[in-house]
């Protein structure tokens, strides 16, 4: 650090004083010197280092008429809002000719109530779930001892006897407030009060109970919710975008979910108005007066196939000699699954009904054995999926080939060429 030489007497006639105070204090350090000739610029040092950005003012008063007479120079360093970083040894420094002079030191000290570097923050936690809160304070004067309070009740017999910087809370069953007191020789400072809101735990065991083509019944086990009863649970369902949508653990749905509310108990809900034979993802969250739990993971589920909702359309049945030609079109009504084929039934008067599986073809030729004389022959057709047969069409009549003669009908399916 620069030092004044001993060859000449120091120009300083007034040295910086001492300041000791609490954080935020405003104070001024002052030094005065008397010099002959042009007044020098006064610099301030803190702990031996020049302060480049000091908030200082310099006043110069001539003691005579001539420039070469003596001058009184006063420099004032203003400290606004005293902080720990302001503390230390302060000196004034001047360069006079080839010599450097420094004043006697003054000291700035911080001593007051503890100051919080970290305070507990508001947060939400699931009921009966461990969490940590943080609090950190400093002096001077040191030491600073902390005392945690829960709902204004101290958690230790005296400051410094309980947890200090970090408070581990093994779990809460009701919304609570936490604060921390910092104690030192000057007194006590109290932190902000953090509100810890207790939400229900995430539900567990979300699973499928039963399923129909257009509805799914799901159930779950509620998590603990502390002293606050669950008011309802919310279930969300989204279409699974052909495997491109939600994967395990993905947080947000790719589209607007279908949302249903379930009053509780029971912890079960029937989701209706779904598409048959369609994959969905579902998740659930439960709510108390304090707010909602976190969502469960997305659970992949699927509605089963249903039977076709209507019969095949535009059935026509015509006869040519011993052959009957029947054709139809796919049902207009929803199939509710993958069409596997058609069943055809035909019956003549006084003859047993014959049931045939046609497969996915939409026409068939029936070979009427013998002389083909069957009266009042009627045909009906139904579509089917893996879930079973849809409704049968109304019977479509064929004109009698030879009225009055009834012979057994022996069917042969002729493959269309």
């Amino acid at each position: 650090a620069p030092r004044g030489t001993q060859a000449e007497e120091s120009p300083f006639v007034g040295n910086p004083g001492n300041i000791t105070g609490a954080r935020g204090l405003t104070g001024t350090l002052r030094c005065q010197l008397q010099v002959q000739g042009e007044p020098p610029e006064v610099h301030w040092l803190r702990d031996g280092q020049i302060l480049e950005l000091a908030d200082s003012t310099q006043t110069q008063v001539p003691l005579g008429e001539d420039e070469q007479d003596d001058w009184i120079v006063v420099s004032q360093l203003r400290i606004t809002s005293l902080q720990l970083s302001d503390t230390g040894q302060y000196q004034c420094l001047v360069f006079l000719g080839h010599q450097t002079f420094v004043s006697q030191p003054g000291y700035v000290g911080l001593e007051g109530l503890p100051y919080f570097l970290e305070e507990p923050e508001d947060r939400t936690v699931a009921a009966n779930t461990p969490f940590n809160l943080s609090c950190q304070a400093q002096g001077p004067p040191e030491p600073v001892d902390l005392l945690w309070l829960q709902d204004a009740v101290p958690l230790a017999t005296a400051p410094g006897h309980g947890p200090q910087r970090s408070l581990h809370v093994p779990g809460l069953n009701k919304t609570s407030s936490f604060s921390c007191e910092a104690h030192n020789a000057k007194g006590v400072t109290t932190s902000r009060t953090a509100t810890i809101t207790v939400l229900p735990q995430q539900p567990r065991n979300l699973h499928l109970v039963s399923r129909q083509p257009t509805e799914l019944e799901v159930a779950w086990t509620p998590g603990l919710s502390g002293i606050y009863p669950l008011t309802h649970c919310t279930l969300q369902a989204v279409l699974s975008d052909d495997g491109m949508g939600i994967q395990a653990g993905e947080p947000d749905p790719p589209e607007e979910p279908l949302t249903s509310q379930a009053s509780v108990p029971p912890h079960q809900l029937r989701l209706g108005s779904l598409h048959p034979h369609t994959p969905y993802h579902i998740r659930v969250a439960c709510t108390s007066s304090q707010g909602p739990s976190s969502w469960t993971h997305w659970l992949p589920v699927e509605t089963p196939e249903g039977v076709p909702l209507g019969p095949p359309e535009n059935i026509s049945a015509t006869r040519n000699g011993s052959q009957a030609f029947v054709h139809w079109q796919e049902p207009r009504a929803p199939l509710q699954g993958t069409l596997l084929g058609y069943r055809l039934a035909y019956q003549g008067q006084d003859t047993p009904e014959v049931l045939m599986d046609i497969g996915l073809r939409q026409e068939v030729t029936l070979e009427l054995q013998g002389d083909g004389s069957v009266s009042n022959l009627t045909v009906c057709v139904a579509a089917y999926t893996a879930a079973g047969d849809g409704p049968w069409s109304l019977p479509v009549p064929l004109e009698a080939w030879r009225p009055g003669q009834a012979q057994p009908v022996h069917q042969l399916v002729k493959e269309p060429s």
Partner: antibody, heavy 119, light 112 residues
């Protein structure tokens, strides 16, 4: 609260049929879930035997397919296991259990019935 | 059918310490939907099996969070962070990806 309670004889002669009953309270067996039978051999090995679904369909372990039948009586909320032509190899503790749909996770189990096959 | 292999056959641990049980499947249990269809059961002495973990890592209701499970498609580990006296019994892994459902041979956890 769902409970499964088992009953049935503890001793069966070889070549005869083993029949056990699982009585369910707290949930209707025709309203949902798969209703399973599992057995545990001496030495602790577990074997899934099959289930009766809430909709009346069945699924059996191929290793037992020709001998096993799982039926139910919805009016009594009971389901049953019948295992034909038993041998000493069928000596085990038999459990009934409720299984979730689609992926069969079994969350409620009966208390178990120890069955010995011996003449 | 899918074969489940567990190790070790038995595991003796001290109260308060951690324990690990391994399970391997003969094929991947990872479904195209992103979930892994492995579960763990605990059978306490004289009791029926009880569900601990489903879909590889989800704790069943009422299961303390000192239990955890992780793994790949074929190799899985059940961990108990601080063993308590009530944790003794036989632990089974099982697969529910497909029928027939199959189980591991079990790992017996006992106290030293």
């Amino acid at each position: 609260q769902v409970q499964l309670k088992q009953s049935g004889p503890g001793l069966v002669k070889p070549s005869q049929s083993l029949s056990l009953t699982c009585s369910v309270t707290g949930f209707s067996i025709s309203s949902g879930y798969y209703w399973n039978w599992i057995r545990q051999f001496p030495g602790n090995k577990l074997e899934w035997m099959g289930y009766r679904s809430y909709d009346g369909s069945n699924n059996y372990n191929p290793s037992l397919k020709n001998r096993i039948s799982i039926t139910r009586d919805t009016s009594k909320n009971q389901f049953f296991l019948k295992l034909n032509s038993v041998t000493t190899e069928d000596t085990a503790t038999y459990y009934c259990a409720r299984g979730w749909l689609l992926h069969y996770t079994m969350d409620y189990w009966g208390q178990g019935t120890s069955v010995t096959v011996s003449s | 059918e899918l074969v489940m292999t567990q190790s070790p056959f038995s595991n003796a641990v001290t109260l308060g310490t951690s324990a690990s049980i391994s399970c391997r499947s003969s094929r991947s249990l990872l479904h195209s939907n992103g979930f892994t269809y492995l579960y763990w059961y605990l059978q306490k002495p004289g009791q029926s099996p009880q569900l601990l973990i489903y879909q590889m890592s989800n704790l069943a209701s009422g299961v303390p969070d000192r239990f955890s499970s992780s793994g790949s498609g074929t190799d899985f580990t059940l961990r108990i962070s601080r063993v308590e006296a009530e944790d003794v019994g036989v632990y089974y892994c099982g697969q529910n990806l497909e029928l027939p459902l199959t189980f591991g041979a079990g790992t017996k956890l006992e106290l030293k």
